[in-house]
Interface confidence: medium
């Protein structure tokens, strides 16, 4: 009798990212016999659920049923029904529900509820949702990012799977920037940290790390401009502001009461004079590099070296990986290639940033204009809080890699999360086993 | 842009059925939630029932096994056909399109049209 290849027993996982801006559903895949591996498990699907982060739904928690369903049923769909019982869910939510927890715990834990209430209706075994720690976000995405590189494997490839990958094992540090919050994570050469907080400890497949993570909340990029526009608004002398970050010839009326909503912008806040400003771009990447270091503070520094507003940072190390919003912003400005120098990407921002709006909008026709309108500003901040923020140095920005996806996974916290909530990273190094019909070569 | 009007609001008996219909003057096609709301006097406006572009739907516990929401893009018409009514379903009945556009860096709440409301009664 002739020999048949036996069927492939596939386990599947999701993870709902509820980030502050928007949701999105991560189903992965991976060889049930394999599950122990390294970089056995994938992406199989991204769905991205339209409509605001859940934390816009606090004043409307009855249409996040609907707000979810989509993507939980496109995640019926591409599971095949037999697995849909044993398939773990969890949605992990990140620095928008961080800020709406601290304006209101209650409020925080009723979208939560209905979130839970809302996955629960599906034939899935939810896990439930919570609101992920800064720390959590950065170590997830560390996790993530080196897992899908191979870091973690003990095999040396003689090839080489991604552009940027080198068969040595030294791990990659993690830069992380989200609309809310941004994470900075490496393992230091120093293992001795300075600052306790900062530091975690992991023992991966036999290895152990000593990692230094740290979450910024209120840098993420729509909360730095929420923090911009509050900083410069207090010295406007009437309802215009003139505004370098945004293109020349652009006008957007702003409300008040909108600028000041966001606990971000509460070390800025006044009395203003009028209820609604218009921002006038004029389009000046220097002087809006200049607006957004004032809001970094590097006057106080309890430490050897710190990053800003007094938190510790040591020295860089290594090669990092620049996901989310990093790679997205950069992407759009087309500023991702290893071949552009610090120097160039300042140069083509200073030419982005002061093309007339008009030709903005021409030039990009299918974009929609409120995004449009902030690559100036986030493609700004970006290279403010890498080089003035985290101190990269135009020679050390050759170790920065804008990575989107890895082998056809999204870079992100929530594969990492994954893999920890399922048991699937062993602290020691699992026993070689026989080939099996289903090995990767 | 599009504009939203309601009809098939009455007054009916308790137990009786009536069918709303919501018309767009535009292309719901490309509009991906429709939903029906409605605001008795005194109370907020609520969601009573959801349909996504891709016929998913969902409804308030209130009216679960009594309300069906429906679609028709090549008619451009969403429905609420109400069965087993009740005295506590009499109110104003709004027709809701929302959408959000999808770009790089999350998505952008681009439309939020509203009918004017059909009054429904429901009494003996």
């Known amino acids: 009798t002739q020999n048949k290849a036996l069927p492939e027993n596939i386990k599947y996982g999701i993870v709902l990212d509820a980030g502050s801006s928007h949701t999105s559903l991560y189903i992965y895949k991976w060889p049930a016999e394999k599950e122990n591996d390294t970089g056995v498990v994938h992406q199989v699907e991204e769905c991205r659920v339209k409509g605001p982060g859940i934390s816009k739904y606090v004043q409307k928690v009855n249409e996040i049923g609907i707000y979810l369903t989509d993507c939980m049923e496109r995640a019926r769909e591409v599971i095949p029904r037999s697995q849909h019982q044993e398939t773990p869910v969890y949605l992990g939510a990140t620095a928008g529900m961080r800020l709406l927890r601290m304006e209101s715990e209650e409020l925080a834990d009723r979208v939560l509820d209905v979130v839970e209430r809302s996955l629960s209706n599906y034939p899935f075994d939810f896990q439930g949702a919570r609101i992920i720690t800064g720390q959590e976000e950065g170590a997830y995405g560390w996790i993530t990012i080196n897992y899908l590189l191979g870091k973690f494997s003990q095999k040396t490839r003689w090839f080489s799977i991604v552009p940027y990958e080198t068969n040595n094992q030294e791990t990659f540090g993690a830069l992380d920037l989200g609309g809310a919050s941004t994470q900075i994570t490496f393992v230091p050469q120093n293992q001795t940290t300075e600052s306790p907080d900062n530091a975690l400890q992991f023992r991966l497949y036999g290895k152990d790390y000593n990692v230094y993570t740290h979450s910024f909340l209120c840098y993420g990029k729509d909360q730095a401009l929420w923090q911009k526009l509050a900083k410069d608004i207090q010295v406007a002398s009437n309802e215009i502001l003139r505004d370098p970050c945004f293109h020349p010839g652009y006008k957007k009326v702003v409300n008040v009461s909108d600028l000041y909503k966001t606990p971000c912008t509460k070390r800025f806040e006044m009395t203003l004079p009028f209820q609604q400003f218009e921002i006038q771009g004029i389009g000046n990447y220097q002087q809006c590099h200049q607006s957004v270091l004032e809001l970094f503070n590097t006057s106080y520094c309890p430490y050897s070296q710190c990053a800003f507003n007094g938190i510790f940072l040591p020295p860089l190390q290594g090669d990092f990986g620049a996901f989310s919003a990093f790679y997205f912003v950069m992407n759009f400005l087309n500023l991702t290639s290893e071949k552009v120098s610090q120097e160039k990407v300042t140069e083509m921002m200073k030419k982005f940033c002061s093309q007339p709006w008009e030709e903005i909008k021409t030039s990009y026709a299918g974009v929609k204009e409120k995004y449009l309108s902030e690559y100036c500003f986030s493609g700004t901040y970006i290279l403010s809080l890498l080089l003035q923020g985290y101190h990269f140095t135009a020679d050390s920005w050759e170790h920065i890699h804008f990575i989107g996806k890895i082998q056809g996974s999204d870079a992100g916290w929530t594969l990492g999360y994954m893999l920890n909530l399922t048991n699937m990273i062993p602290a020691e190094q699992p026993l070689s086993t026989p080939l099996s019909h289903s090995t990767y070569v | 842009e599009v504009q939203l009007l309601e009809s098939g609001g009455g007054l009916v008996q308790p137990g009786g059925s009536l069918r709303l219909s919501c018309a767009a003057s535009?292309?719901?096609?490309?509009?991906?939630?429709m939903s029906w709301y409605r605001q008795a006097p005194g109370n907020e406006r609520e969601l009573v029932a959801a349909i996504t572009g891709r016929g998913n739907t969902n409804y308030a516990d209130s009216v679960k096994g009594r309300f069906t929401i429906s679609r028709d893009n090549s008619k451009n018409t969403v429905y609420l056909q109400m069965n087993s009514l009740r005295a506590e379903d009499t109110a104003v009945y709004y027709c809701?399109?929302?959408?959000?556009?999808?770009?790089?860096?999350?998505?952008?709440?681009?439309?939020?049209?509203w009918g004017q409301g059909t009054q429904v009664t429901v009494s003996s």
């Open positions: 535009g292309d719901i096609f490309s509009i991906n939630y």
């Open positions: 809701n399109a929302w959408d959000y556009s999808d770009a790089d860096e999350g998505p952008l709440r681009e439309y939020d049209y």
